[in-house]
Interface confidence: low
């Protein structure tokens, strides 16, 4: 059936509407649109003849209508007068007519509303306020928003006058919010600007901060007063009942014991006419001296010396406190406190014991901290590190070696080649090296304060030919789906390209394979049994190339779900039962059997001669791989029938 759908049904003035045609018949001669509920030539909007593809405007055509090939009609720049019914007249090729009517409604766009109020400064717990949404508009719905939320349910909130008026009875400071009204009709919704309700309140009882009531002689007293109030309160201070000043803050520098007493803050609201006061009692105590730390050894040697730190001065009936690295003392057998906590002893100091250390004296009010003290722990040298780590060089390049050893004070360095002293520097540089520069390169680090020396030797080979590489692995027996393996191609050589092969092929593309460290390291993530292959690394430079021997990865896996063979489950009485269990596993698993839950033997094969119906039941094979720590099992039901009772049964082995 031919139907008309209006999209949208409610249209705003100035917008457009589409009269969408559904179920348009086939084989049409043409169609025509009319204003109204019937076909009336005087009210024709547009006609269209399919054969000529010609659209002809009618008497009611306004220039705002557009017809589409599917007979749908678009009307633009809608006016109020467009409201109503529209009829489509369809003429089929057999000249049979069909009609359908649709309609839409036109509404005006609403203006932006505004809010008027009967009281701009209501007083808390006393006044009421009435908000009215302007203008009054026909066929409009009125809504209210408080802080962009719909109105809360409250007996103090009342809507009236068709929801145009919102009354707040007995206002409170919590009613200080953003109020908006909204007008709606089927085609538009407009919100007013915010109106902020300014509720006068307070002052509440003032709060004096900080809450601290005990001070030391010589400190500054800085009290601040605050009372919730609108408009903001005016403040006055009284000390022991005597007026001091009209400010929110009271500041007295360098107080003495004589400044002890009662301090009163008074808050006043000039609009509400209310006053509130709060009193705090301040006590000023005499000042103890600032502590400091002395040490019996300012340059202790690591792993040799002990250090005793003492907190000065000594004061009777005083609690001493210690901090290391701004933390309270850690529990350690190398840290010892004296009975009065005044001396902290560090037994056998290490380089990590440098501190800083602070001590403190506890008094009635607070803790007085010493200045921090840092220990100068002499240590090292540690074994030197020679960099870079290359051991093979090509002739003609420059050799630049650097040596470093952790040491305090910093180490002094010497270089030896094949035991012969070269120079006393941290770096060794030899330009344009030849095969003759191959040899043992020794770095010696010396600590002049501790008198200790340490050496590291590095073999340097200068050769155009690269050595045969080898593969090192961080995991010789990885577990499937659990472990990763990192292969590294040795040695590390300068200006060298590293290559990898798996089973004689170049590396496959896989998210589980990752090259790093300049392709020197090949990492296999989440290894699988299929990774148990031959891995070869190669090194090459511009003049030579070499390959390592293959390394075969031994992946531990399984046991998989076992299989019991033969598959038969029905046997004749008197037959032999010979069950074999197999599970894929590396290394081979341990096998055990259970019949009806009762443990049997730890073998791969279970043999029972001349079975009877008493041997009916569940036969379970259990497999265990001690290397992977994993287990698996399978259960098989066996039925034994008396001889000749069931045709087709297995005779057994």
């Amino acid at each position: 059936k031919l139907t008309i759908e209006s999209t949208p049904f409610n249209v705003a003035e100035g917008k457009e509407v589409l009269l969408l045609v559904h179920n348009l018949p086939q084989h049409l001669f043409g169609y025509s649109w009319y204003k109204g509920e019937r076909v009336d030539g005087n009210r024709q909007i547009i006609g269209y003849v399919i054969g000529t593809q010609q659209a002809t405007p009618g008497p009611a055509y306004s220039g705002r209508e557009i017809i589409y090939p599917n007979a749908s009609l678009l009307i633009q720049n809608i006016i109020q007068n467009d409201t109503g019914f529209y009829t489509l007249h369809v003429i089929k090729s057999d000249l049979v007519n069909e009609e359908a009517t649709g309609q839409f409604r036109v509404y005006p766009e609403l203006p932006k509303p505004s809010i008027s109020s009967n009281n701009s400064k209501p007083v808390e717990d006393k006044d009421a306020v009435a908000f009215t949404c302007e203008p009054e508009t026909q066929d409009a719905t009125y809504l209210w928003w408080v802080n962009n939320q719909s109105l809360p349910v409250s007996p103090r909130l009342q809507l009236s006058n068709g929801n145009r008026t919102l009354t707040l009875f007995n206002v409170t400071r919590n009613d200080t919010a953003s109020y908006k009204c909204e007008t709606q009709n089927p085609v538009s919704a407009r919100r007013s600007d915010s109106v902020i309700l300014n509720v006068l309140y307070g002052p509440d009882a003032p709060t004096i901060s900080p809450l601290n009531t005990s001070y030391r002689s010589g400190e500054n007293l800085n009290l601040s007063c605050h009372a919730a109030s609108n408009p903001p309160a005016q403040y006055s201070w009284f000390v022991n009942g005597t007026f001091q000043q009209s400010t929110q803050e009271l500041f007295i520098p360098n107080i003495t014991v004589n400044n002890s007493g009662s301090y009163t803050c008074q808050a006043h609201n000039s609009d509400t006419g209310l006053n509130r006061t709060t009193v705090t009692t301040i006590t000023v105590y005499a000042e103890p001296p600032k502590p400091f730390i002395t040490s019996n050894n300012s340059n202790p040697v690591e792993d040799e010396d002990a250090v005793a730190l003492t907190c000065e001065p000594e004061i009777q009936n005083t609690t001493y406190l210690w901090w290391v690295n701004n933390q309270s003392l850690p529990v350690s057998p190398r840290l010892q406190l004296s009975n009065d906590n005044r001396t902290l002893t560090l037994l056998s100091v290490t380089r990590n014991d440098v501190g800083p250390y602070e001590c403190g004296i506890q008094n009635e009010l607070s803790v007085d901290h010493s200045d921090p003290v840092i220990l100068n722990v002499l240590y090292g040298p540690d074994d030197p590190t020679i960099s870079p780590s290359y051991t093979y060089y090509r002739p003609g390049v420059n050799l630049s070696l650097s040596c470093h050893a952790a040491s305090n004070p910093p180490a002094q360095y010497s270089w030896l080649i094949d035991g012969n002293i070269q120079q006393h520097t941290q770096e060794l540089f030899i330009s344009n090296i030849t095969e003759k520069n191959s040899g043992l390169y020794t770095c010696q680090a010396n600590n002049s304060a501790s008198g200790h020396s340490r050496t590291t030797v590095k073999t340097i080979t200068v050769s155009a030919e690269l050595p045969k590489p080898s593969i090192s692995s961080n995991n010789s027996k990885p577990v499937e789906d659990k472990d990763a393996v990192a292969f590294t191609c040795e040695p590390e050589a300068q200006n060298t390209t590293y290559l990898w092969w798996v089973n004689g092929q170049s590396l496959p593309v896989s998210p589980r394979l990752q090259l790093s460290n300049g392709n020197r390291t090949l990492t296999l993530f989440n290894v699988t049994r299929n990774d148990a292959r031959a891995y070869v690394c190669g090194i090459q430079n511009s003049v030579s190339a070499n390959r390592s021997d293959p390394v075969t990865l031994d992946v531990l896996y399984g046991p998989d779900t076992p299989i019991i063979s033969p598959p038969d489950s029905s046997y004749l009485s008197g037959a032999n039962l010979n069950l074999s269990c197999h599970s894929a596993s590396n290394p081979s698993p341990q096998y055990s059997w259970r019949i009806n839950g009762i443990p049997q033997q730890h073998t791969q094969v279970l043999f029972i001669a001349k079975i009877t119906p008493n041997n009916n039941g569940t036969y379970a094979c259990f497999v265990s791989n001690l290397a992977t720590g994993r287990n698996n099992s399978i259960v098989k039901s066996i039925t034994v029938s008396a001889s000749g009772t069931s045709p087709g049964l297995s005779a057994g082995a």
């Epitope: 457009e16 269209y48 000529t52 593809q53 010609q54 659209a55 002809t56 405007p57 557009i66 017809i67 589409y68 090939p69 678009l74 633009q76």
Partner: nanobody
Framework: QVQLVESGGGLVQPGGSLRLSCAAS????????MSWVRQAPGKGLEWVSG????????RYADSVKGRFTISRDNAKNTLYLQMNSLKSEDTALYYC??????????RGQGTQVTVSS
């Protein structure tokens, strides 16, 4: 005299893209509803797409929906048709037209689009 000049047609492989342009002059382009229509060899005129005056309302024939995009630049007096995922059945002479483009309202001379491998 209304002037409409189409350009941007050509030979393209199936799955390819083209962007047609239509330069308008001698009439108030910014206040006119505009359409693209096409005529395949031996076939009648087929409406493809339409766009209202400010470009906020567009419509498409079912055969091109999701593949073609109509747009306009009123400052340049130019209408566009971006054609993606072209098929052999899109081969036709493409016209831009004033209004709904169904027999009333002027058309340009057209630009040929051929989709073939």
């Amino acid at each position: 005299q209304v002037q409409l000049v189409e350009s941007g047609g050509g030979l393209v492989q199936p799955g390819g893209s083209l962007r047609l342009s239509c330069a308008a002059s001698e009439f108030t382009f910014s206040s006119s509803y505009m359409s693209w229509v096409r005529q395949a060899p031996g076939k009648g005129l087929e409406w493809v797409s339409g766009i209202n005056t400010d470009g906020s309302f567009t419509r498409y024939a079912d055969s091109v929906k999701g593949r073609f995009t109509i747009s306009r630049d009123n400052a340049k007096n130019t209408l566009y048709l971006q054609m993606n995922s072209l098929k052999s059945e899109d081969t036709a002479l493409y016209y831009c037209a004033v209004g709904g483009g169904l027999g009333y309202g002027p058309r340009g001379q057209g630009t040929q689009v051929t989709v073939s491998s």
